[in-house]
Amino acid sequence: GSERTCCPVNWVEHERSCYWFSRSGKAWADADNYCRLEDAHLVVVTSWEEQKFVQHHIGPVNTWMGLHDQNGPWKWVDGTDYETGFKNWRPEQPDDWYGHGLGGGEDCAHFTDDGRWNDDVCQRPYRWVCETELDKASQEPPLL
């Protein structure tokens, strides 16, 4: 298959990845589906440098990222190892808070107004960021 060598229209290139920043809000799962239909994934933050880049583009607005613990342990949507990877939680977060009255705890991670991360109810309609890597195969094999 072919490889993507430049970013799609309306996406921003940075360090061999392409980023798309929403201006509307969706629940985490719907944002996740949206990115997948763009042949991308919710943003996976792997360094302080990438954190600053994303933070610069989203501003002081709650924004979903590709990190969740809906099945137990915290996991990045692209398989990046959580335990050994970059983290930027707010103090005392994640706390899986149950006091919001919406049922259940908090299983999805988002950037807060200062860029640090918080876990929140996955149904909240936050903005989101999609990411796709350049130079990865962007095409299924041709149909026979």
Epitope: P8, V9, N10, S22, R23, S24, G25, K26, A27, D30, N33, Y34, R36, L37, E38, D39, P125, S138, Q139, E140
Partner: antibody, heavy 120, light 108 residues
Framework: QVQLVESGGGVVQPGRSLRLSCAAS????????MHWVRQAPGKGLEWVAV????????YYADSVKGRFTISRDNSKNTLYLQMNSLRAEDTAVYYC?????????????WGQGTLVTVSS | DIQMTQSPSSLCASVGDRVTITCRAS??????LNWYQQKPGKAPKLLIY???SLQSGVPSRFSGSGSGTDFTLTISSLQPEDFATYYC??????????FGQGTKVDIR
Amino acid sequence: QVQLVESGGGVVQPGRSLRLSCAASGFTFSSYGMHWVRQAPGKGLEWVAVISSAGSNKYYADSVKGRFTISRDNSKNTLYLQMNSLRAEDTAVYYCARRYSSGWDWFDPWGQGTLVTVSS
Amino acid sequence: DIQMTQSPSSLCASVGDRVTITCRASRNISNYLNWYQQKPGKAPKLLIYVVSSLQSGVPSRFSGSGSGTDFTLTISSLQPEDFATYYCQQSYSSPPWTFGQGTKVDIR
């Protein structure tokens, strides 16, 4: 101009298979997700399936999951819907439509449709 | 899944009438709401996207409003070519993308 043309419809017996095609022209087909939407005679619109621009992600309505497969060949600017184990309730006009996305998304344009009739 | 309910299911109107069609979502969909027009034997055509944005080429007599769960499509002065069926559709929680059952606008 942007155009979508469906083909492959016809009369088929229950339990049999059919493959629909949708030929696209007038736009960069490989840059857009694509949908199939159907409309039973005298009824409303029902979303069937969607495929991402590169074909790596696909979603289906519960009513067709496990029986229908959406695929695409970007080198031929063509979208497909493979329909297996067809049932009488699959009788409908099947439309392909381009997925236009900007955070919000909608269906535009639509093909003219192809009629599938499942009957013994 | 989010259910979309249109009312009325059908209506009769005369040329020049002001026509209003409503669409209600089973839960909040913010402004993720589109409208389509379908004439008999033809494919649907995008009319309005994101509640109130008119698709290119759509006459200004068509307008959309609303937010959250309640939305309205208005035709300010019905023309002969407007007799058709109109569908609302949500894209907030998708898949699945869901449509209203349609509103048929007939000539009185």
